[in-house]
Interface confidence: medium
């Protein structure tokens, strides 16, 4: 009679993470008598996966009933596969011996490869806000996928970005991999409503890529433009001066009025109006009692936006006396200057 052979017909098996792997193994003879064991890896460091004779292997089930006398099918199923299960599995026939069974013959091995989906990409932006025309970096990370081949793309509002660096780690062989990418994005004043998208495509996703997003509203700071104007005189001795604060983001803004360098009033932007591009406008006004001033008045609108150094715009009120009339009249001249 021919000597027993252990046949593992599948050189390789590819299984998705979470699924069950079937590892096939048959013997060509019932002789010699003795158990079958399954190992992952070869040599002294091999890992026992299943022992027909003894032990508890909760994830392993046999395909056929190994208690039947004439059984020669030693195939097993391993449940709930993870990337850590990848490796080469050997079906090994032992011969009954005393006191221990003796290894008789091994199959050629079946390489188990695990396909694991990447985790949802996580996109993170810079810790501090930046202003338009500046370049900021966004990172995208996804983990736990296998095999290594993966495609990552960056988009800003649907337009693909090209300025990015991507690493897949580790560089060598591993049971699963991580991807890390850094993209550079130039901010514009219109980016309050913009989104940066990181898209990851992998064989396990069957053409339906995963996306991670970041809103540029969390990254951008659009500094305000200021305009100080004098409104028509309400009463004979009063002038209404307004400060238009336009196109700023985020909303956090504090405005201080100064008369000849002295603080007159401080207020916080509350009832703002929103522009189509997501920036805000706000107006503050100051009623100046001209009769209280003998000399020209320098009015300054000083704005502190989002904790940044204050910007200001000034307006000179020319105060001149007309002897024909009682009290003092005003001639106002807008000599606004931008001061930082």
């Amino acid at each position: 009679e021919e000597e027993l052979q252990v046949i593992q017909p599948d050189k390789s098996v590819l299984v998705a993470a979470g699924e069950t792997a079937t590892l096939r193994c048959t013997a060509t003879s019932l002789i010699p008598v003795g158990p079958i064991q399954w190992f992952r890896g070869a040599g002294p460091g091999r890992e026992l996966i299943y022992n027909q004779k003894e032990g508890h292997f909760p994830r392993v089930t046999t395909v056929s009933d190994l208690t039947k006398r004439n059984n020669m099918d030693f195939s097993i199923r391993i449940g709930n596969i993870t990337p850590a299960d990848a490796g080469t599995y050997y079906c090994v026939k032992f011969r009954k011996g005393s006191p221990d069974d003796v290894e008789f013959k091994s199959g050629a091995g079946t390489e188990l490869s695990v396909r694991a989906k990447p985790s949802a990409p996580v996109v993170s932006g810079p810790a501090a806000r930046a202003t338009p025309q500046h370049t900021v970096s966004f990172t995208c990370e996804s983990h736990g996928f296998s095999p290594r081949d993966i495609t990552l793309k960056w988009f800003k509002n649907g337009n693909e970005l090209s300025d990015f660096q991507t690493n897949v780690d580790p560089v060598g062989e591993s049971v699963s991999y991580s991807i890390h990418s850094t993209a550079k994005v130039v901010l514009t004043r219109e980016d309050v409503h913009s989104q940066v998208i990181c898209e990851v495509a992998h064989v396990t996703l069957q053409g339906d890529p995963l996306r991670g997003t970041a809103n540029l509203s969390e990254t951008i700071r659009v500094p305000p433009t200021l305009e100080v104007t004098q409104q028509p005189v309400r009463a004979e001795n009063q002038v209404n001066v307004t400060c238009q604060v336009r196109k700023f983001y985020p909303q956090r803004l504090q405005l201080t009025w100064l008369e000849n360098g002295n603080v007159s009033r401080t207020e916080t932007a509350s009832t703002v109006t929103e522009n189509k591009d997501g920036t805000y406008n706000w107006m503050s006004w100051l009623l100046v009692n001209v009769s209280a001033h003998r000399d020209d008045v320098k009015l300054t609108c000083q704005v502190e936006h989002d904790g940044q150094p204050a910007v200001s715009k000034s307006h000179d009120l020319k105060v001149s006396a007309h002897p024909k009339e009682q009290g003092s009249n005003t001639a106002a001249e807008n000599t606004g200057s931008n001061e930082r």
Partner: antibody, heavy 119, light 107 residues
């Protein structure tokens, strides 16, 4: 035995290019990566990039991107490293080293090629 | 990029001493860490790969350990030929990076 033989020392002027060769023998050339590492006098080791000799895949260190070109000729079992726009700070010993495909360690090194950049 | 910090930068020891050099990675690199020895005017020589695997032909007085971010190279019973500079190198992520080196000098 496994050996990496590098080309001889070079003296270059700033702005010029240098091309260093690394001839491999004693093993299957296409089964490994070839790394290029440099060492400025009195300083540590600095990885420049690698080429997988089998499929030609290349990875450069961002520091040298745009200035370094790594190639290989499988029939000649030789790897090449070209560095352009040379400056005085590029004066260094340039090593090629055979790389493992799993842990990416460098187990066999060439003797090094001294490149001097001077006007 | 992963930074690799080696310490100490230099040490003085005598023949027969037990010497330990440490290497710390700025993020977890599993066991993708290798150790090299370099003597003046010579190319580096691989001692240990995969954190703890001794390279063929390297004396058993050299040993490596660690995983994640902290690693060490130990030389048991320092020999005259061991006075050299030692470098660790992470091979987890590109750009591959080396530690700054540790010079082992004769006391």
């Amino acid at each position: 035995q496994v050996q990496l033989v590098q080309s001889g020392a070079e003296v270059k002027k700033p702005g010029a290019s240098v091309k260093v060769s690394c001839k491999a023998s004693g093993y299957t050339f296409t089964s490994n990566a070839m790394h290029w590492v440099r060492q400025v006098p009195g300083q540590g080791l600095e990885w420049m990039g690698w080429i997988k000799a089998g499929n030609g895949e290349i990875k450069y260190s961002q520091k040298f991107q745009g200035r370094v070109t790594i190639t290989r000729d499988t029939s000649a079992t030789t790897a090449y490293m070209e560095l352009s726009s040379l400056r005085s700070e590029d004066t260094a010993v340039y090593y090629c080293a055979r790389g493992d495909y799993y842990y990416y360690y460098m187990d066999v090194w060439g003797k090094g090629t001294t490149v001097t950049v001077s006007s | 990029d992963i930074q690799v910090t080696q310490s100490p930068s230099s040490l003085s020891a005598s023949v027969g001493d037990r010497v330990t050099i440490t290497c710390r990675a700025s993020q977890s690199i599993s066991d993708f860490l290798n150790w090299y020895q370099q003597k003046p005017g010579k190319a580096p020589k691989l001692l240990i790969h995969a954190a703890s695997s001794l390279q063929n032909g390297v004396p058993s007085r050299f040993s490596g350990s660690g995983s994640g971010t902290d690693f060490s190279l130990t030389i048991n019973s320092l020999q005259p030929e061991d006075f050299a500079t030692y470098y660790c190198q992470q091979s987890y992520s590109t750009p591959l990076s080396f530690g700054g080196g540790t010079k082992v000098e004769i006391k």
